[in-house]
């Protein structure tokens, strides 16, 4: 499996293809948004993962989870199973 890969970037063009480990079964895309922003400021995170549930449980730092749980940040996690399927903008 190949997936787009980038960490906490505000520019999707910074993502690059990466060959996953044999244990990885999905490509994940995580979008972190400030819902109060009129510009809908956001960052994107793309990666290989063993499962979508793993991403939801392990990607976010304690620091970010504080903002997510309080509603300051909003998170969307999408997963797919085909090569580079997480390459769409955002």
């Amino acid at each position: 499996l190949w997936c787009q890969d980038c960490t906490l970037t505000t520019n999707s063009s910074h993502c690059t293809p990466k060959q996953c480990q044999p244990s990885d079964t999905v490509c994940a895309s995580v979008r972190i948004t400030d819902p109060s922003s009129s510009r809908k400021d956001h960052s994107v995170n793309k990666m290989c993962a063993s499962s979508c549930d793993f991403v939801k449980r392990h990607f976010f730092s304690d620091y970010l989870m504080g903002f997510i749980n309080s509603g300051i940040l909003k998170v969307d996690v999408d997963c797919c199973e085909k090569d580079l399927c997480n390459g769409a903008a955002g």
């Epitope: 960490t7 906490l8 970037t9 505000t10 972190i32 400030d34 109060s36 922003s37 510009r39 400021d41 956001h42 960052s43 392990h58 990607f59 730092s61 304690d62 620091y63 970010l64 504080g66 903002f67 309080s70 300051i72 940040l73």
Partner: antibody
């Protein structure tokens, strides 16, 4: 280009209260960022004091929490630091900085810093 | 609190050298690691965020790598303006903490 500028007294007496303000220009304090204070004693490393969001939500370093208050004034596009019961150990360069939480929590813009000396 | 330990504490090198500074966290911080450069009398400047992302405007000779507990900052070919003190910083949990710094000096 976001710019930050610290201001406040450079000398504070022991047991007194240190008060500093950070003026933000070139951007809104109500943006998708938190706003932080970091200090650096002479010749030493960096220590995070705490941070504030435009809503007034705060996070503080537990080692200083009992003495620290950070507040925000959206109408003036600025935020402030108060540190009470100061001692010589609080002598440091105090920096204000913008925190980019969308990219995980880094300090992407800094003020130039202001030296505060605690002495009688 | 998460302790951040940098090595070496100081380093002498020459213009053109390849230099690597390491930072170790006392527990896993995933990729929530940032690097700063500080020159005397100046504020720190963000170089690398999220372990490996180059901050806008920072020369490409700077690069970062690592995840979990071990991280590196590499300067591929030292320039005269690179002699400074470098700090790592974790943003995995509060309190946010910094390494003690690595002073890079001219040999």
């Amino acid at each position: 280009q976001v710019q930050l500028q610290e201001s406040g007294p450079g000398l504070v007496k022991p047991s007194g209260t240190l008060s500093l303000t950070c003026a933000v220009s070139g951007g809104s304090i109500s943006s998708s960022n938190w706003w932080s204070w970091v200090r650096q004693p002479p010749g030493k490393g960096l220590e995070w004091i705490g941070e504030i969001y435009h809503s007034g939500s705060t996070n503080y370093n537990p080692s200083l929490k009992s003495r620290v208050t950070i507040s925000v004034d959206k109408s003036k596009n600025q935020f402030s630091l108060k540190l009470s019961s100061v001692t010589a150990a609080d002598t440091a360069v105090y920096y204000c900085a913008r925190v980019d939480i969308l990219t995980g929590g880094n300090f992407d813009y800094w003020g130039q810093g202001t030296l505060v000396t605690v002495s009688s | 609190d998460i302790q951040m330990t940098q090595s070496p504490s100081s380093l002498s090198a020459s213009v053109g050298d390849r230099v690597t500074i390491t930072c170790r966290a006392s527990q896993s911080i995933s990729s929530y690691l940032n690097w700063y450069q500080q020159k005397p009398g100046k504020a720190p400047k963000l170089l690398i965020y999220a372990a490996s992302s180059l901050q806008s405007g920072v020369p490409s000779r700077f690069s970062g790598s690592g995840s979990g507990t071990d991280f590196t900052l590499t300067i591929s070919s030292l320039q005269p303006e690179d002699f400074a003190t470098y700090y790592c910083q974790q943003s995995y949990s509060t309190p946010i903490t910094f390494g003690q710094g690595t002073r890079l000096e001219i040999k």
